[in-house]
Interface confidence: low
């Protein structure tokens, strides 16, 4: 139960990519404001986004403290201008979020091909190791730092003159593939955590093709 002029938040949804994590909810407030609390299963509640008229709250700073923990959030509704007011049960109206485990659930952001280098009939394709907001010893960790060998990349490559794609996988950020001499190739990569059951794959990177600026070519 709550006060007559407030409504409980609903559709609480976690939106998370590379650990940048925002809780969203409805409805847009009319004469009310929200405060969010977040907790691990065993921890204390911590308040964030105090008395906001937004319908989202950035909880990244909290979840990056331990991305393997499971988090729960709740959104409190208060009458605008009277945030001390409580419901008949002596507390403001609130709604719980689904549980969220960042390591298992954060979406993988679109990767970027950093470079490719041809040496004879071999091409080395390097994927940019994207920085996350997860910190260790005051430095930001890369996606690879966080996921280690749980993270792989799939490379799709094809001759510019045809549509038949080949694939390769790596659990580093580099591929070394064989190509036909004198042929130009195009490349796209996808980040994958195959051991996951949800949010296993990123969207494909932008396509990069040989003969464009990104590459470097050395014939032997």
């Amino acid at each position: 139960s709550g006060t007559t002029n407030t409504v409980a938040a609903y559709n609480l949804t976690w939106k998370s990519t590379n650990f940048k994590t925002i809780l969203e909810w409805e409805p847009k407030p009319v004469n009310q404001v929200y405060t969010v609390q977040i907790s691990t299963k065993s921890g204390d509640w911590k308040s964030k986004c105090f008395y906001t008229t937004d319908t989202e709250c950035d909880l990244t700073d909290e979840i990056v403290k331990d991305v393997k923990q499971t988090y729960l959030a709740r959104v409190f509704s208060y009458p605008a201008g009277n945030v001390e007011s409580t419901g008949s049960a002596g507390e403001p109206l609130y709604e719980n979020s689904p549980e969220f485990t960042p390591y298992l659930e954060t979406n993988l952001g679109q990767p970027t091909i950093q470079s490719f280098e041809q040496v004879g009939t071999k091409v080395n394709v390097t994927v940019e190791d994207e920085r996350t907001l997860v910190r260790r010893n005051n430095t930001f960790l890369s996606l690879r730092d966080v996921f280690g060998k749980d993270l792989i990349y799939t490379l799709y490559y094809w001759k510019s003159s045809s549509s038949g794609k080949k694939t390769a996988k790596t659990n580093t950020n580099e591929f070394l593939i064989d190509v036909d001499k004198g042929e130009n190739y195009c490349f796209s990569v996808q980040a994958v955590i195959p051991s996951r059951t949800v949010n296993r794959k990123s969207t494909d990177s932008p396509v990069e093709c040989m003969g464009q600026e990104k590459g470097e070519f050395r014939e032997i």
């Epitope: 485990t101 298992l104 060998k149 749980d150 993270l151 792989i152 080949k166 694939t167 390769a168 996988k169 790596t170 659990n171 955590i193 195959p194 051991s195 996951r196 059951t197 949800v198």
Partner: antibody
Framework: EVQLVQSGAEVKKPGASVKVSCKAS????????MNWVRQAPGQGLEWMGE????????TYNQKFKARVTLTVDQSTNTAYMELSSLRSEDTAVYYC???????????WGQGTTVTVSS | SIVMTQSPKFLAVSLGERATINCKAS??????IAWYQQKPGQSPKLLIY???NRYTGVPDRFSGSGYGTDFTFTISSLQAEDVAVYYC?????????FGGGTKVEIK
């Protein structure tokens, strides 16, 4: 430490069903696909199917699709494989196996021997 | 489904010598190949994945190579504890399929 502990050996009559369990520990059960592989005496390995413990969705080898059912119990971190209409050629060791990054099976149960005999 | 053909079925090698097993896929599986070791009365054990990557804790005498349809698994210097049956498996396309196995013995 990741462990997959399977139920004990079974002896069944032709036409009966058998249900083998696989209790997982040491990792997030819903975070990895669970697969079932069988091995007839003196034979090679044969993949039967896999289940997503998070959703219960499963994929089967067409050969077994009509007779095998994969289920999970998230509350006990246990996967189950039920094979119906048993025949003598189903006599085999049945393994559960956790699928790792990229697809290989990194952790295996100890195996459950199922003997089908009249 | 993809058929994996493994050869030879039996391989006898002297201690300290090289053992080589081949696996051929009926269609391209990229580098989606794993290799397993199975000792008598035991469950299979993952040795190699992505055709050439050693799994955690696997000694470096075990190696793999290949791409597309043709793959090779090598034990560079056979030890007594390597006596086992070895299987290739494609994890490129469901249904996941295994080779028929190669029994490695000491000559």
């Amino acid at each position: 430490e990741v462990q997959l502990v399977q139920s004990g050996a079974e002896v069944k009559k032709p036409g009966a069903s058998v249900k083998v369990s696989c209790k997982a520990s040491g990792y997030s059960f819903t975070g990895y696909y669970m697969n079932w592989v069988r091995q007839a005496p003196g034979q090679g390995l044969e993949w039967m199917g896999e289940i997503n413990p998070s959703t219960g969705g499963s994929t089967y080898n067409q050969k077994f699709k009509a007779r095998v059912t994969l289920t999970v119990d998230q509350s006990t971190n246990t996967a189950y494989m039920e094979l119906s209409s048993l025949r003598s050629e189903d006599t085999a060791v049945y393994y559960c196996a956790r699928r790792e990054l990229g697809g290989p099976f990194g952790y295996w149960g100890q195996g459950t021997t199922v003997t089908v005999s009249s | 489904s993809i058929v994996m053909t493994q050869s030879p079925k039996f391989l006898a090698v002297s201690l300290g010598e090289r053992a080589t097993i081949n696996c051929k896929a009926s269609q391209s599986v990229s580098n989606g190949i794993a290799w397993y070791q199975q000792k008598p009365g035991q469950s299979p054990k993952l040795l190699i994945y992505f055709a050439s990557n050693r799994y955690t804790g696997v000694p470096d005498r075990f190696s793999g190579s290949g791409y597309g349809t043709d793959f090779t698994f090598t034990i560079s210097s056979l030890q007594a504890e390597d006596v086992a049956v070895y299987y290739c498996q494609q994890d490129y396309s469901s249904p996941w399929t295994f080779g028929g196995g190669t029994k490695v013995e000491i000559k």
